[in-house]
Interface confidence: low
């Protein structure tokens, strides 16, 4: 038999692992698809992205709503011939998440 | 030109994105390499894992120290011939992280 306290601890853990927006470190350059001679400092920003577990293997944790937040970053061109520019960079921030079916794969793909 | 306040905000953001142990959702079965007919409920647990950004592309955020924490989970075998067993599962928990050089690649690899 299982004592109620243990079950409560397990359930709390499970709630915390479920699909939800989580603070995540995102690399700006790859996010924006910038050219290799442009980089950002800091290279990463904190935003919320969907993450966590779904109850079934056929489901995947995906965003259902997104906002865009502006982060002030230095945009730097290499070689460093001009002064690093302080630019506002818009990064996707997931505000809602849901366990959704993975996209069906074409049998011949 | 940059006012000091903006620099402070950028620096705080950068500190928060840096390589450190972060609470992460880990799938227990794949973590333990369990057979497909054994699964756990809940399927995921929260542990700390190294994550975040490194200052250079040649570096990767890796764990320098690890502890193992015990999580109480239901181990379920398929087909369900027995009552789900409450078992202690040891999962790696990263306690220290560092930006380390990626393993050097063999020239012919």
């Amino acid at each position: 038999f299982y004592d109620i306290e243990t079950l409560k601890v397990i359930d709390e853990e499970w709630q915390r692992t479920q699909c939800s927006p989580r603070e995540t470190c995102v690399e700006v350059a790859s996010e924006l698809g910038k050219s290799t001679n442009t980089f950002f400092k800091p290279p990463c920003v904190n935003v919320f992205r969907c993450g966590g577990c779904c109850n079934e293997e056929s489901l995947i944790c995906m965003n259902t709503s997104t906002s865009y937040i502006s982060k002030q970053l230095f945009e730097i061109s290499v070689p460093l011939t001009s002064v690093p520019e302080l630019v506002p960079v818009k990064v996707a921030n997931h505000t809602g998440c849901k366990c959704l079916p993975t996209a069906p794969r074409h049998p011949y793909s | 030109f940059y006012d000091i306040e903006t620099l402070k905000v950028i620096d705080e953001e950068w500190q928060r994105t840096q390589c450190s142990p972060r609470e992460t959702c880990v799938e227990v079965a794949s973590e333990l390499g369990k057979s497909t007919n054994t699964f756990f409920k809940p399927p995921c647990v929260n542990v700390f894992r190294c994550g975040g950004c490194c200052n250079e592309e040649s570096l990767i955020c890796m764990n320098t120290s690890t502890s193992y924490i015990s999580k109480q989970l239901f181990e379920i075998s398929v087909p369900l011939t027995s009552v789900p067993e409450l078992v202690p599962v040891k999962v790696a928990n990263h306690t220290g992280c560092k930006c380390l050089p990626t393993a050097p690649r063999h020239p012919y690899s």
């Epitope: 230095f74 001009s82 690093p84 520019e85 | 940059y2």
Partner: antibody, heavy 117, light 112 residues
């Protein structure tokens, strides 16, 4: 409050090497995007940008003077050093240290260097 | 190098009257990021240059609103709507779009 102060010899002889030090406060050269540079102004003439050094130790020199200039930094001391070799009387000027932002907001008071035998 | 040509070299002014300084660059000062890095500085006698206008038309903090900047591409103007005695000194235009960063030869503003 950002301040920069230049120090070095007031007089150098032709062919000698000039060494100037910029000591700054109010910011750190380890801060992203930060740079410190040097600009000079011969008496009654226009300003001329010489060199700058970035937080990541990248350096940039005015191509005309590149072979004569070396810029370096000591982040822990909040100092930047400029050396200029083979000084000539035409190098007589007030040498300014600046915080390299776009544009230059903070300048040192300048130090007058006279090249004469 | 980008050559910055300022006119006039000298500008005698009467307090309360307007004044205008022109700055022309040998190449367009529009950076690939779309910004135009043309700035104006005032060097008062015995002092370091001080920033007045940045990126063509933006007044730096604390700069009186009698100062204004305009222009685009290669032609730029600094205007003082009503000159005051404290405005005397040498005005420099500067570009930081292309390296090496360069300055104009200066315009000496003096009271008549």
């Amino acid at each position: 409050q950002v301040t920069l102060k230049e120090s070095g010899p007031a007089l150098v002889k032709p062919t000698q090497t000039l060494t100037l030090t910029c000591t700054f406060s109010g910011f750190s050269l380890s801060d992203y995007g930060m740079g410190v540079g040097w600009i000079r102004q011969p008496p009654g003439k226009a300003l001329e940008w010489l060199a700058n050094i970035w937080w990541n130790d990248d350096k940039y020199y005015n191509p005309v003077l590149r072979s004569r200039l070396t810029i370096s930094k000591d982040t822990s001391k909040n100092q930047v050093v400029l050396t200029m070799t083979n000084m000539d009387p035409v190098d007589t000027a007030t040498y300014y240290c600046v915080q390299v932002t776009n544009p230059f907001v903070f300048w040192g008071q300048g130090t007058l260097v006279t090249v004469s035998s | 190098d980008i050559v910055m040509t300022q006119t006039p070299l000298s500008l005698p002014v009467t307090p309360g009257e307007p004044a205008s300084i022109s700055c022309r660059s040998s190449q367009s000062l529009v950076h690939i990021n779309g910004n135009t890095y043309l700035h104006w500085y005032l060097q008062k006698p015995g002092q370091s240059p001080q920033l007045l206008i940045y990126k063509v038309s933006n007044r730096f903090s604390g700069v009186p609103d009698r100062f204004s900047g305009s222009g685009s591409g290669t032609d730029f103007t600094l205007k003082i709507s009503r000159v005051e005695a404290e405005d005397v000194g040498v005005y420099f235009c500067s570009q930081s779009t292309h390296v090496p960063w360069t300055f104009g030869g200066g315009t000496k503003v003096e009271i008549k």
